[in-house]
């Protein structure tokens, strides 16, 4: 006979997993807030900027009470994937003006990627149904001008900030229900 079976693998405490996800999200939120402020200092925004390709905000703060964990994580992952794609696009096609936001924009991209991997891990640890593979997204058109890239940056960082703020609140609320 082979060696005796080892002890059963204990799945990590989902609350601890959720905690580390909250910490990553909160850290990314602070980074985004600071980078958005840096952008406003360098290129003051003339009003609010929108980008049609960005996801709409997942939830108003008032509607947080009705949230369920699978829905929150699936939606958050989808939205953050979209923001990751937009940050990558911004770094690639945003123009020379936005080079002044490096290396911070690169750090933001890396941390966003890390948070997405953490969310994926959390979903598997919680045995939540894995979302289907993302359909290939249509390529984002390059900004029409340097100012177009700056406007896009305002929209992306502003939207990401709101999304992460919603995410921190939602995840903390969900933690109390685990």
């Amino acid at each position: 006979p082979g060696p005796p079976p080892g002890p059963p693998r204990v799945s990590p405490d989902p609350r601890a997993e959720l905690d580390s996800t909250v910490l990553l999200t909160r850290s990314l939120l602070a980074d985004t807030r600071q980078l958005a402020a840096q952008l406003r200092d360098k290129f003051p925004a003339d009003g609010d900027h929108n980008l049609d390709s960005l996801p709409t905000l997942a939830m108003s703060a008032g509607a947080l009470g009705a949230l369920q964990l699978p829905g929150v994580l699936t939606r958050l992952r989808a939205d953050l994937l979209s923001y990751l794609r937009h940050v990558q696009w911004l770094r690639r096609a945003g123009g020379s003006s936005l080079k002044t936001l490096e290396p911070e924009l690169g750090t933001l991209q890396a941390r966003l990627d890390r948070l997405l991997r953490r969310l994926q891990l959390l979903m598997s640890r919680l045995a939540l149904p894995q979302p289907p593979p993302d359909p290939p997204a249509p390529p984002l058109a390059p900004p029409s001008s340097a100012w177009g890239g700056i406007r896009a940056a305002h929209a992306i960082l502003g939207g990401l900030h709101l999304t992460l703020d919603w995410a921190v609140r939602g995840l903390l609320l969900l933690k109390t229900r685990l």
Partner: antibody
């Protein structure tokens, strides 16, 4: 050597106004975010307001929002706090403070403070 | 807002003893956003420890910080007479930035 020197404190009646100044030297003022922090007599520290290097992002504590205005003049290496509709509970020593080298490293440099007394 | 609660409110120790000051945070915060300050009577606060465990410039090695999540600690390994003061923790991850109410370290 980094130096921050506050001025403009004094005695003011409730409902009155006061403008505090903070003169900065020994560093490139236009490169750093700046804060005002206050301390009521015998009490702890309370953060009041923050302004980014280019003045385009400003945050306030809820207790002063709508009454206080933080501003800066990078050409004069100066930070300001305009305080309107003053209340007795605004009585405190007001400090200006500079962030360390990054925004997430705490308030590394402080002035000596200026006392604001709101009383009739 | 994020609330920081320091304990004990007052700590009475003798020079040479070890001091352990606690800061409990109402929400989980990343450790890079937790800082400690020292304030002596009639003086401005002084940054002691930033990002939970990094000593600020000129701070002696007897001061150290640790912690994560919601529980953070400032330790003074062997108290010197000049260490008796009030100590504050502060978070910088969320606006409004907030301080703990302080721990007064006094000579026994």
């Amino acid at each position: 050597e980094v130096q921050l020197v506050e001025s403009g404190g004094g005695l003011v009646q409730p409902g009155g106004s006061l403008r505090l100044s903070c003169a900065a030297s020994g560093f490139t003022f236009s490169s750093f975010g700046m804060h005002w922090v206050r301390q009521a007599p015998g009490k702890g520290l309370e953060w009041v307001a923050y302004i980014t290097p280019g003045s385009n992002t400003i945050y306030y504590a809820d207790t002063v929002k709508g009454r206080f205005t933080i501003s800066r003049d990078n050409a004069k290496n100066s930070l300001y706090l305009q305080m309107n509709s003053l209340r007795a509970e605004d009585t405190a020593v007001y400090y200006c403070a500079r962030e360390y080298y990054s925004y997430d490293e705490g308030f590394a440099y402080w002035g000596q403070g200026t006392l604001v007394t709101v009383s009739s | 807002e994020i609330v920081l609660t320091q304990s004990p409110a007052t700590l009475s120790l003798s020079p040479g003893e070890r001091a352990t000051l606690s800061c409990s945070v109402s929400d989980l915060i990343p450790s890079q956003y937790l800082h400690w300050y020292q304030q002596k009577p009639g003086q401005a606060p002084r940054l002691l420890i930033y990002r939970t465990s990094n000593r600020a410039s000129g701070i002696p090695a007897r001061f150290s910080g640790s912690g994560s999540g919601t529980d953070f600690t400032l330790t003074i390994s062997s108290l010197e007479p000049e260490d008796f003061a009030v100590y504050y923790c502060q978070q910088g991850v969320d606006v409004p930035f907030t301080f703990g109410q302080g721990t007064k370290l006094e000579i026994k």
